[in-house]
Interface confidence: low
């Protein structure tokens, strides 16, 4: 009822001391080679002169980090990246980075890469609001970081920030002009 030589599984390595004979009920645990991760049970058991169990090692490495337009990779380049390895990007001038500067190899897949955007980020005319208007003459194009202010028509009250700012090509949230409650 004893078991003889250990079974071999692709990319799996038996742990502990190797023996010629294993007693019934004895268990042997396997670990995976570099770049591989155990999928399911990691051990085999000797039952009636046969080994039961099938440790499976899955390739969790990544290749070819995502290409980011107008960016280059600044961390060391590898032909294969183990799960958990990070790759760092830098934007070419004059582009600005939005999102995480690093991607990570996560069980065979890369996390989302950043974007390198043109930092000009201009805005169009400010959004119109009900019962209110901007205090300056509206332009067709606004430079990044420029601000405009709103004012409400007579008898309406302003709720929120009266000033909005152009950031990354978008205006911040405009205020509302509410009709005051009349008692």
């Amino acid at each position: 009822t004893d078991c003889l030589s250990l079974p071999s599984f692709e990319n799996a390595i038996p742990m502990g001391e190797k023996k010629d004979v294993y007693k019934a009920g004895e268990q042997v645990t396997y670990t995976c080679a570099t770049y591989y991760k155990m999928d399911g049970a990691s051990n085999v058991t000797c039952i009636n002169s046969r080994w039961t169990g099938r440790p499976t090692c899955r390739d969790t490495s990544c290749v070819n980090p995502p290409t980011v337009q107008n960016a280059y990779i600044v961390s060391r380049q590898m032909s294969k990246y183990p799960s958990g390895e990070r790759v760092r990007y830098q934007c070419r001038s004059p582009y600005e980075m939005f999102g995480d500067e690093e991607v990570m190899c996560l069980n065979g897949n890369w996390t989302e890469p950043p974007q390198c955007k043109d930092s000009t980020g201009k805005c169009g005319p400010p959004p119109p609001i009900d019962n209110g208007d901007i205090t300056s003459f509206p332009l067709s194009v606004y430079a990044p970081a420029s601000s405009v202010e709103y004012q409400c028509q007579n008898l309406y009250q302003l709720e929120g920030n009266k000033r909005i700012t152009c950031r990354n090509g978008q205006w911040s949230e405009p205020p509302k002009c509410l009709h005051p409650c009349v008692i």
């Epitope: 980075m97 939005f98 999102g99 995480d100 500067e101 990570m104 996560l106 897949n109 996390t111």
Partner: antibody, heavy 112, light 106 residues
Framework: QVQLQQSGPGLVQPSQSLSITCTVS????????VHWIRQSPGKGLEWLGV???????DYNAAFISRLNINKDNSKSQVFFKMNSLQANDTAIYYC???????????WGQGTS | QIVLSQSPTFLSASPGEKVTVTCRAS?????MHWYQQKPGASPKPWIF???NLASGVPARFSGSGSGTSYSLTISRVEAEDAATYYC?????????FGNGTKLELK
Amino acid sequence: QVQLQQSGPGLVQPSQSLSITCTVSDFSLARYGVHWIRQSPGKGLEWLGVIWSGGTADYNAAFISRLNINKDNSKSQVFFKMNSLQANDTAIYYCARNFGNYAVDYWGQGTS
Amino acid sequence: QIVLSQSPTFLSASPGEKVTVTCRASSSVKYMHWYQQKPGASPKPWIFATSNLASGVPARFSGSGSGTSYSLTISRVEAEDAATYYCQQWSIIPPTFGNGTKLELK
């Protein structure tokens, strides 16, 4: 081990500002982004914004006009400031470390 | 913004039972994350990018899904699993969270 320690007032008057400092240890702000998330019984978990490792910030459009996030890498500190607070801003505010885009692994203890 | 609807809101299960929490998105998303939160504590990462268990999470947990429908499954629920579970999408800014599913053990 990785930690994010928050410090800031527990009580803010209406129309005043909330300022919270998040001091991190065991990792560098030059390598990891830090998110700000709040939690309230009425609205649940809400993502407010993030400051990335490179220093650029992304904000939730609903808060962009009254929220500012910046940091000092050398002091391992991230600074959060929200203006014009109202009663419906009552919540627990958390800073949390970025893990891949927009997911977080380690959280601060929260500021009520 | 993308709205995430979790169901059920409340779940009562006996130890050893199989439990599934569903998260539906108002538009298609690329991945879903899951967090566990216990009373008085900060949320903890539980499952990253749909199916990757965070460090220290027991193998009885699993995540799956695509498009607008995602789920978190516990194959045999244990007492320590009692908590609130939140899903989170990050395909479109702003990242949004589900309303939470509170799991109670009988």
